[in-house]
């Protein structure tokens, strides 16, 4: 969480951003809030990016003002116009690109004053893993697949019964480049699996951590997965 202040005295307003990550090819949110102002027509929101000459986005007098927008963001940005009056200056970024990563500044002017805060935006690819029993294998085998990751993640297996055990000798992980030549499909196979145990496939890079769990018993198979972004720090 980054909290920025404007000029000292009564002309400063608090602006708060949250570092976040974008999943390339999907839409992302750059989060920014400020002390709300009841005078909508006086509110100005400017999003800037370090190293970019034009503006990322500008909102003033109740609407988008995109005449100064940089070419790389053309047609890809929007604020939540109906939320500006309650202090939400967050930016929606469509079709996130790898090159969107960097330091952004959320700069706010209201009738009460000015303020700004920086935001670190990381970009990459992350997806939920799915763990299945591989019935084609000669021994009891689990197969963990996740369709899109970048940068290349690490994959670690764990088990509820054998806590702390190192499964690197009995697992094999491969990375297959996807058709857009950036993201990769992750496939990890775990051999010599025992029944009545819960196994976890953990995939992690510097942006996200995802876990796929599978519980295999004689009568049923239960699956669960979740994904967590690693760098959601407020500023």
């Amino acid at each position: 969480l980054i909290i920025g202040f404007g000029i000292s005295g009564r002309h400063s307003i608090t602006v708060t951003t949250v570092a976040s990550a974008g999943n390339i090819g999907e839409d992302g949110i750059l989060s920014c809030t400020f002390e709300p102002d009841i005078k909508l027509s006086d509110i100005v929101i400017q999003w800037l990016k370090e190293g970019v000459l034009g503006l990322v986005h500008e909102f003033k007098e109740g609407k988008d003002e995109l005449s100064e927008q940089d070419e790389m963001f053309r047609g890809r940005t929007a604020v939540f116009a109906d939320q500006v009056i309650v202090g939400n200056a967050s930016l929606r970024l469509k079709n996130v690109q790898l090159t969107d990563a960097g330091t952004y500044k959320c700069y706010i002017i209201t009738s009460k004053g000015k303020g700004n805060a920086n935001l670190e935006y990381k970009t990459g690819a992350f997806s939920m893993p799915e763990v299945n029993v591989d019935y084609n294998a000669s021994s009891e085998t689990l197969r963990c697949e996740a369709p899109r990751w970048f940068p290349q993640p690490t994959v670690v297996w764990a088990s509820q019964v054998d806590q702390g055990a190192n499964f690197s000798e009995v697992s094999n992980t491969s990375f297959e480049l996807n058709s857009e030549n950036v993201t990769m499909k992750v496939v990890s196979v775990l051999y010599n699996v025992t029944i009545n145990n819960t196994y976890s496939c953990m995939i992690e890079n510097d942006i996200a951590k995802a876990t796929g769990d599978i519980k295999v018993t004689e009568s049923e198979i239960k699956r669960r997965s979740h994904l967590q972004l690693l760098n959601s720090k407020a500023s």
Partner: antibody
């Protein structure tokens, strides 16, 4: 859930003052503007003013400037509206209303103020 | 101050009717307009925000549209519980101002 609970009805004499309270629960009181709107019998809605409790910033409608005072007690999440030099035309229902998710999204139940000699 | 002219001031309609209420601003309010419903003895109820977005729990028979200076609230098929007074509110320019209200009565 969000609730705005106002104080009870008041009967006042011309020239007196009235102070209406509005106790808030269910959202961060200090971080959002609280407004006051009044409605005379059989009439429309009229905005009076607003307060930002976190900084005690206030904004008033020109019509009420100098006669209305908005305050807030952040320890009890309560907003107050005081109207002085009352006259018969001030007989109305007074509402507090929040701007939490949107402008005037939640309303108090209203406080009837009757000004009569 | 921006003036909001609401019309009609009252109308009579039957259950099932399509009802349209308009609000005209004295200048462009850039879609910064909400609608409220009020029944006798009750506070206004938040209905539509930012011209066309339905507030939580509001039935889909209510809809809003408009831009610039002209805005409309439509009830596609009037129900008995919709008989009430409706107000528009502009919050683009300070101070916020309400329309005069439209009373929807049973024919």
């Amino acid at each position: 859930q969000v609730q705005l609970v106002q104080s009870g009805a008041e009967v006042k004499k011309p020239g007196a003052s009235v102070k209406v309270s509005c106790k808030v629960s269910g959202y961060p009181f200090t971080s959002y503007w609280m407004h006051w709107v009044r409605q005379a019998p059989g009439q429309g809605l009229e905005w009076m003013g607003a307060i930002y409790p976190g900084k005690s910033d206030t904004e008033y409608a020109q019509k009420f400037q100098g006669r209305v005072t908005l305050t807030a007690d952040t320890s009890t999440s309560t907003a107050y509206m005081e109207l002085s030099s009352l006259r018969s035309e001030d007989t109305a229902v007074y509402y507090c209303t929040s701007t939490w998710t949107h402008y005037f999204d939640y309303w108090g139940q209203g406080t009837t103020v009757t000004v009569s000699s | 101050d921006i003036q909001m002219t609401q019309s009609p001031s009252s109308l009579s309609a039957s259950v099932g009717d399509r009802v349209t209420i308009t609000c005209q601003a004295t200048q462009d309010i850039v879609k910064s307009l909400n609608w409220y419903q009020q029944k006798p003895g009750k506070p206004p109820k938040f209905l539509i925000y930012y011209t066309a977005q339905l507030a939580e729990g509001v039935p889909s028979r209510f809809s809003g549209s408009g831009s610039g200076t002209d805005y409309t609230l439509t009830i596609s098929s009037l129900q008995s519980e919709d008989f009430a007074t409706y107000y528009c509110l502009q919050f683009y320019e300070f101070p916020p101002t309400f329309g005069g209200g439209t009373k929807v009565e049973i024919k």
